[in-house]
């Protein structure tokens, strides 16, 4: 379970049309459910239930985004559909280049993600918790444009990694 170094860049536009970027660094773990690879893309927050569309003819997103899923407490979920492995797979099927799970409220998801090694996804599946998860969700919940870059080695300078 290697460390995943995640950089999140938030784009804040000003009334003049310019924008400012804010870079936040956080760490997670690569799970055995996916590959230990670098990945980058615009963040799309995915509601856990939204991943379980009963209709198989669902719309696909454009390829190359990073899905962020905040997992709920499993005991009280009224309609559990996909397991956490299923959620990761569905996100990748729908075009995610990586998936990041906030497991703070569902720590048992860590074991589930690390049991899924028989047929791992070819894209990274990362989990975050605690202060790192709070930082990530604070950015995601702003509902502004943000990009994430996931690496398996510490980043050098943030400016090296984003083509603005």
């Amino acid at each position: 379970k290697e460390t995943a170094f995640v950089e999140v860049v938030l784009f804040e536009s000003s009334p003049s049309g310019d924008y400012t970027t804010y870079t936040t660094g956080l760490t997670g773990r690569f799970s055995r459910a996916g590959a230990t690879l670098s990945a980058e893309g615009e963040i799309v927050q995915m509601h856990p239930l939204g991943l379980c569309n009963n209709n198989d003819e669902e719309d696909l997103y454009e390829y190359g985004w990073v899905g962020v899923v905040k997992l709920e407490q499993p005991e009280l979920d009224p309609k559990p559909c996909l397991t956490v492995l299923g959620k990761a797979k569905r996100a990748v099927q729908r075009g995610a280049t990586a998936v990041i799970f906030d497991v703070s409220e569902n720590p048992e998801a860590i074991d589930q993600l690390n049991q899924g090694s028989e047929d791992p996804l070819k894209r990274p599946v990362v989990y975050v918790k605690g202060a790192d998860a709070i930082k990530l969700m604070n950015i995601v919940n702003k509902q502004k444009v943000a990009r994430a870059r996931i690496q398996h080695r510490p980043p050098r300078q943030p400016t090296e990694y984003f083509d603005m």
Epitope: C81, L82, K89, E108
Partner: antibody
């Protein structure tokens, strides 16, 4: 094609136990929760509980916590429900259904009679 | 637990007729309402999820609507195979609960 194939009807004695199976195919077993639903003769549907096939963790409603034991066998893609201390109240058809309740088994009739 | 009240319990109707089945929740369920059809042989077929979304393969004569606590299933023009049982189900809060069912009968 997603299929949930349940075991056949059972005639059992009061006080005994019965274990019914739900063999799945057409999808990755560990990707979806598996749910169980009860239907008594000429009555409505009651959700019993669910199992996560990855780790075997279960959640059941209070009424079934001591009555039903849910298990899953990843090697055969099969889920099981064992019902214990059977009474006439347990005479019913039991359905397994995949997470999202979009695919259902054909049902297993359990008749409790002496 | 949220109680689901379906009405009517029995609904006599004719071929080609348009019918509506109602389902009321004991508290708001924010559109988390599904409809199922149960055939005479016991087979259960999902029809509609999240109030108004048709499952794959379900004929377009079926439609769902509603909000808050009140929801309905409408069948536009009844076909012979439609005369069977229908159930609503909420999955807004744990545990998921079903209505008692509506039997659609040939008049």
């Amino acid at each position: 094609e997603v299929l949930l194939q349940q075991s056949g009807a059972e005639l059992v004695r009061p006080g005994s136990s019965v274990k019914i199976s739900c063999k799945t195919s057409g999808y990755t077993f560990t990707d979806y929760y598996l749910h169980w639903v009860k239907q008594r003769p000429e009555q409505g549907l009651v959700w019993i509980g669910r199992i996560n096939p990855i780790n075997g963790k279960t959640v059941c409603i209070e009424k079934f916590k001591t009555k039903a034991t849910l298990t899953a066998d990843k090697s055969s893609n099969t889920a099981y429900m064992e019902l214990s201390s059977l009474t006439s109240e347990d005479t019913a058809t039991y359905f397994c259904t995949r997470g999202g309740l979009a695919y259902w088994g054909q049902g297993t009739l359990v008749t409790v009679s002496s | 637990d949220i109680q689901m009240t379906q009405s009517p319990s029995s609904l006599p109707a004719s071929l080609g007729e348009r019918v509506t089945i109602s389902c009321r929740a004991s508290q708001g369920i924010s559109n988390n309402l599904n409809w199922y059809q149960q055939k005479p042989d016991g087979t259960i077929k999902p029809l509609i999820y999240y109030t108004s979304n048709l499952q794959s393969g379900v004929p377009s004569r079926f439609s769902g609507s509603g909000s808050g606590t009140d929801y309905s299933l409408t069948i536009g023009s009844l076909e012979p195979e439609d005369f069977t049982m229908y159930y609503c189900q909420q999955d807004a809060s744990f545990p998921p609960t079903f209505g008692a069912g509506t039997k659609l009968e040939l008049k």
